[in-house]
Interface confidence: medium
């Protein structure tokens, strides 16, 4: 379970049409459900129930985005349509270059993602929790354009990376 170093850039437009970028760094973990790879793409927030839809034609994105999924408490969804692993697979099938799960409300998902699939996904599946998850979801919930870059090695100057 290697550390995933995630950088997120948020694009804030100004009335003049220019934009300002805000970069923030956070850490997560690569799960055994996916590959320990670098990835980058525009963030697409996905609702866990949205991944239940079987009609892939209806909900197909172009390839290359990073899916962000906030998992709910298990009690709120006692009979999920898909396992967490199934949700990761569905996101990758729909074109995600990586999937990031916020497991703060559902820590059991960590074990599910790390059970060691015989057929792991060829794209990274990362989970975040706590302060890192709050940071990520604050950006995602702004409903503005944001990009994520996932790295599998730590920066050699952490202060430079995290001092945003």
């Amino acid at each position: 379970k290697e550390t995933a170093f995630v950088e997120v850039v948020l694009f804030e437009s100004s009335p003049s049409g220019d934009y300002t970028t805000y970069t923030t760094g956070l850490t997560g973990r690569f799960s055994r459900a996916g590959a320990t790879l670098s990835a980058e793409g525009e963030i697409v927030q996905m609702h866990p129930l949205g991944l239940c839809n079987n009609n892939d034609e209806e909900d197909l994105y172009e390839y290359g985005w990073v899916g962000v999924v906030k998992l709910e408490q298990p009690e709120l969804d006692p009979k999920p349509c898909l396992t967490v692993l199934g949700k990761a697979k569905r996101a990758v099938q729909r074109g995600a270059t990586a999937v990031i799960f916020d497991v703060s409300e559902n820590p059991e998902a960590i074990d599910q993602l790390n059970q060691g699939s015989e057929d792991p996904l060829k794209r990274p599946v990362v989970y975040v929790k706590g302060a890192d998850a709050i940071k990520l979801m604050n950006i995602v919930n702004k409903q503005k354009v944001a990009r994520a870059r996932i790295q599998h090695r730590p920066p050699r100057q952490p202060t430079e990376y995290f001092d945003m």
Epitope: F5, V9, T23, S38, G41, E62, T97, V145, R156, E160
Partner: antibody, heavy 120, light 107 residues
Framework: QVQLVQSGAEVKKPGSSVKVSCKAS????????INWVRQAPGQGLEWMGG????????NYAQKFQGRVTITADESTSTAYMELSSLRSEDTAVYYC?????????????WGRGTLVTVSS | DIQMTQSPSSLSASVGDRVTITCRAS??????LAWYQQKPGKAPKLLIY???SLETGVPSRFSGSGSGTDFTLTISSLQPEDFATYYC?????????FGQGTKVEIK
Amino acid sequence: QVQLVQSGAEVKKPGSSVKVSCKASGGTFSNTDINWVRQAPGQGLEWMGGIIPIFGTANYAQKFQGRVTITADESTSTAYMELSSLRSEDTAVYYCVGGRSGWIWYFDLWGRGTLVTVSS
Amino acid sequence: DIQMTQSPSSLSASVGDRVTITCRASQSISRWLAWYQQKPGKAPKLLIYDASSLETGVPSRFSGSGSGTDFTLTISSLQPEDFATYYCQQAYSFPWTFGQGTKVEIK
């Protein structure tokens, strides 16, 4: 103003390797992407891969995977691109490309290019 | 990989002409597109980023438009120094890919 200064032209035999260097002068690039883009004579531009020195991890285009290695030495603000198993089609100008700050996806800072000729 | 296709591959124009170059992506890339100018023996130069934002120091006769899969670079009044090759580049996802180039020649 950061400038990217590349090593000189190289002539190589097929099957050998070449290592091109790119030094940032007038600044450091520790948290800026350094990418390598090549251009064969009379042809278009082709992205080979890139690295962020503070991470040390590189991303490569599938076409070059296994044949190219991109590294960076923060202490000297120098990035390197090594291409192995050279063939005549690798004859090209190799550009070191970066951005003025942060991780980038558009290339606003270019080295002058290094001509690599592969000939027996 | 995302394929970028430019048209035309070359064109002849006169000083003062309005010139339009198009670039088509094989899938939607939102607005993650740049345009570069390259003169013989020189490194490319960034002109436009995010499909329509003008890079600092680039003359305002250059403009970009489009989103999704279809993009356009326009030079409103061609100047002698604008005769060059122009490339588009997608920045939506790895690997970054370029169009094959459009050469603008003197008529």
